[in-house]
């Protein structure tokens, strides 16, 4: 609103950089054939590029990415008992970011 | 995949807490009647609750919220020249979070 500005601080741009985000570990990453299990933990922290660039022709993109394997539990109930196996999920962390030009969409041929 | 676990660290849960997120300041927040302007900055940082809880019946929810007015620029092009006006946008920061029981969906009557 174009209203009273007395107590409003100037807004600071959220610069293009890595920030901590929450990544949900979907069950499909562990087992596509079965839905009767739980993944623990259900979500983990990852580093991801976010923020704004100076104009609409550029976007905040990762320039350096690292894959990080982590061990999760696949928990099933078998004969009333929770049993679990270990599974590995590969997370993607962004290490560095840059405002990069967005390539023009190619015309459909 | 249920594969080689040698280099995989145990996954740590992304706990329910406040994290820094990027909030895009949409033009509709400034002026719903006009689209011929630009907002600067286009995005800002806010504090938001995120993360996972122990089961599906609870969700990470804010228990304390603070409204924070910030001053942005509404930039219009009038007769080829940029005209700056100040506008106030009220941001919502989450100050504290908690895993709270999700109320059962009410039946449609």
């Amino acid at each position: 609103s174009l209203g009273s500005l007395t107590i409003a601080e100037p807004a600071m741009i959220a610069e293009c950089k890595t920030r901590t985000e929450v990544f949900e570990i979907s069950r499909r990453l562990i087992d596509r054939t079965n839905a009767n299990f739980l993944v623990w933990p259900p979500c983990v922290e990852v580093q991801r590029c976010s923020g704004c660039c100076n104009n609409r022709n550029v976007q905040c993109r990762p320039t350096q990415v690292q894959l990080r394997p982590v061990q999760v539990r696949k928990i099933e109930i078998v004969r009333k008992k929770p049993i679990f196996k270990k599974a590995t999920v590969t997370l993607e962390d962004h290490l560095a970011c840059k405002c990069e030009t967005v390539a023009a969409a190619r015309p459909v041929t | 995949s249920l594969g080689s676990l040698t280099i995989a660290e145990p996954a740590m849960i992304a706990e329910c807490k406040t994290r820094t997120e990027v909030f895009e300041i949409s033009r509709r927040l400034i002026d719903r009647t006009n689209a011929n302007f630009l907002v600067w900055p286009p995005c800002v940082e806010v504090q938001r609750c995120s993360g996972c809880c122990n089961n599906r019946n609870v969700q990470c929810r804010p228990t304390q919220v603070q409204l924070r007015p910030v001053q942005v620029r509404k930039i219009e092009i009038v007769r080829k020249k940029p005209i700056f006006k100040k506008a106030t946008v009220t941001l919502e920061d989450h100050l504290a979070c908690k895993c709270e029981t999700v109320a059962a969906a009410r039946p449609v009557t």
Epitope: L38, I75, R79, K80, K81, P82, F84, K86 | -
Partner: antibody
């Protein structure tokens, strides 16, 4: 408040059959995931699990005692009954019933009765 | 068949000291299961302390903590109170064998 209480004879003769009743309150054995188990403890020795019965009438027994044990429930009376045939002096122990839940996060006895001492002697 | 081996058999400590109790689970299966811990005082029924390896049961003081995974599990009492002197049992289960208890560790006053 969840409570469980065991009842049965304090003394049985060798070769006889022991019948113990667990009467509980504060939960229902018709609730999904709910179970009741029996555990015993000979004097000065460790705990030994005997049997579990579940909300859906599934029953599980200690393999080494399976042919001597029978567990049953009466949901309307909030009772679980354990029978043990061919009693022997080595079966002298305190017998406990306890609540157990089948859950992603747990498979443990969270509430216990005070126990009933059973002596097997002629 | 799953076997739980607790050590030591007896732990002699003074109030205020830290107690570390071990529970070793025999492996041999391609899956893992949770370990729980119970406290038993003379003439009383056992009381659940820890379930799912490291979660404290309702009303249990935070001086009790559980840790471990795979085959080796630990119950730690960070600072022994007079009421903590008791026998402690670990418990786990298998798909076929169902519930198994360890042989117990007695924590006695030194």
């Amino acid at each position: 408040e969840v409570t469980l209480r065991e009842s049965g004879p304090a003394l049985v003769k060798p070769t006889q059959t022991l019948t113990l009743t667990c009467t509980f309150s504060g939960f229902s054995l018709s609730t999904y995931g709910m179970g009741v188990g029996w555990i015993r403890q000979p004097p000065g020795k460790a705990l030994e699990w005997l049997a579990n019965i579940w909300w859906d009438d599934d029953k599980y027994y200690n393999p080494s005692l399976k042919n001597r044990l029978t567990i049953s429930k009466d949901t309307s009376k909030n009772q679980v009954v354990l029978t043990m045939t061919n009693m022997d002096p080595v079966d002298t122990a305190t017998y406990y019933c306890a609540r157990i839940e089948s859950h992603w996060w747990s498979y443990a006895f969270d509430y216990w009765g005070q126990g009933t001492m059973v002596t097997v002697s002629s | 068949e799953i076997v739980l081996t607790q050590s030591p058999g007896t732990l002699s400590l003074s109030p205020g000291e830290r107690a570390t109790l071990s529970c070793e689970r025999s492996s041999g299966s391609n899956y893992d299961t949770y370990v729980s811990w119970y406290q038993q005082k003379p003439g009383q029924a056992p009381r659940l302390l820890i379930y799912a390896d490291d979660l404290r049961a309702s009303g249990i003081p935070d001086r009790f903590s559980g840790s471990g995974s795979g085959t080796d599990f630990t119950l730690t009492i960070s600072r022994l109170e007079p009421e903590d002197f008791a026998v402690y049992y670990c418990q786990s289960y298998g798909i076929e064998t169902d519930i198994v208890f360890g042989g117990g560790t007695k924590v006695e006053i030194k």
